[in-house]
């Protein structure tokens, strides 16, 4: 006996009460694949969730988080509080990054500033709570006598005017 249900397309369900006729999914439900014997209830985006995509007969609703929160988990199953740049989220809420660390996003943890000296470079721009340090040329590149495209200007003693 051929299973007539396999002919039922997405957006319908196989109604056993009606001789395996394909019936459309009732309001607020969907079936994303063919051959379904039931339709799934649409997800409701409420509370801290807002609707990113409405539910249709063939696909579930997609939720996003309201302003001040960001999605966590598969399919935005949770909303986590945003912090400001320069902060990280702890058990006691948003806390400023400790000295020597930064966070340039509204989520995630504070990360240590780049250690320029590990790459043999010097600090060009100091780090802040919101920004990493910017590494520049190595100290050796900046010392007098180092080869460069333009020769360094002659050194003068402070307080002496050029001859």
């Amino acid at each position: 006996l051929q299973d007539l249900c396999s002919n039922c397309p997405a957006g319908t369900f196989c109604d056993n009460n009606r001789s395996q006729i394909c019936s459309p999914c009732p309001p607020n439900s969907f079936s994303s694949a063919g051959g379904q014997r039931t339709c799934d209830i649409c997800r409701q985006c409420k509370g801290v969730f807002k609707t990113r995509k409405e539910c249709s007969s063939t696909s579930n609703a997609e939720c996003d988080c309201i302003s001040g929160y960001h999605c966590l988990g598969a399919e935005c199953s949770m909303c986590e509080q945003d912090c400001k740049q320069g902060q990280e989220l702890t058990k006691k809420g948003c806390k400023d990054c400790c000295f020597g660390t930064f966070n340039d996003q509204k989520r995630g943890i504070c990360r240590p500033w780049t250690n320029c000296s590990l790459d043999g470079k010097s600090v060009l721009v100091n780090g802040t709570k919101e920004r990493d340090v910017v590494c520049g040329p190595s100290p050796a590149d900046l010392s007098p006598g180092a080869s460069s495209a333009t020769p360094p200007a002659p050194a003068r003693e402070p307080g002496h005017s050029p001859q």
Partner: nanobody
Framework: QVQLVESGGGLVQAGGALRLSCAAS????????IGWFRQAPGKEREGVLC????????IYADSVKGRFTISRDNAKNTVYLQMNSLKPEDTAVYYC??????????????WGQGTQVTVSS
């Protein structure tokens, strides 16, 4: 069954004060955080304040700093939102919600039905 019920809303003049209550039934608030959210007409819902199970307070909305405070009375299974120096822009439906922790909300969290606060100028 599990329920959160808000009360204490009403009409108040700008500069006035209100104290909202969020009473829990069907479960104990001892191990739950309680957050207050609000939704003004035509606007997205926004977080206001939250108090953790240990009493730590998180302020979500900078605009309420120094004006709104949150407290809990575990013996009465109730959390309070004290709103002072009210402004017309505080007009909204205020909801309480019981997440596990103040920083993270899921679709399983219990929400109240809301209480209307209207601030007239």
């Amino acid at each position: 069954q599990v329920q959160l019920v808000e009360s204490g809303g009403g009409l108040v003049q700008a500069g006035g004060a209100l104290r909202l209550s969020c009473a829990a039934s069907g479960f104990t608030l001892d191990y739950s955080a309680i957050g207050w959210f609000r939704q003004a007409p035509g606007k997205e819902r926004e977080g206001v304040l939250c108090i953790s199970s240990s009493g730590d307070v998180t302020i979500y909305a900078d605009s309420v700093k120094g004006r709104f405070t949150i407290s809990r009375d575990n013996a009465k299974n109730t959390v309070y939102l004290q709103m002072n120096s009210l402004k017309p822009e505080d007009t909204a439906v205020y909801y309480c919600v019981a997440p596990r922790i103040c920083s993270t909300y899921s679709s399983d969290d219990y929400w109240g039905q809301g209480t209307q606060v209207t601030v007239s100028s």
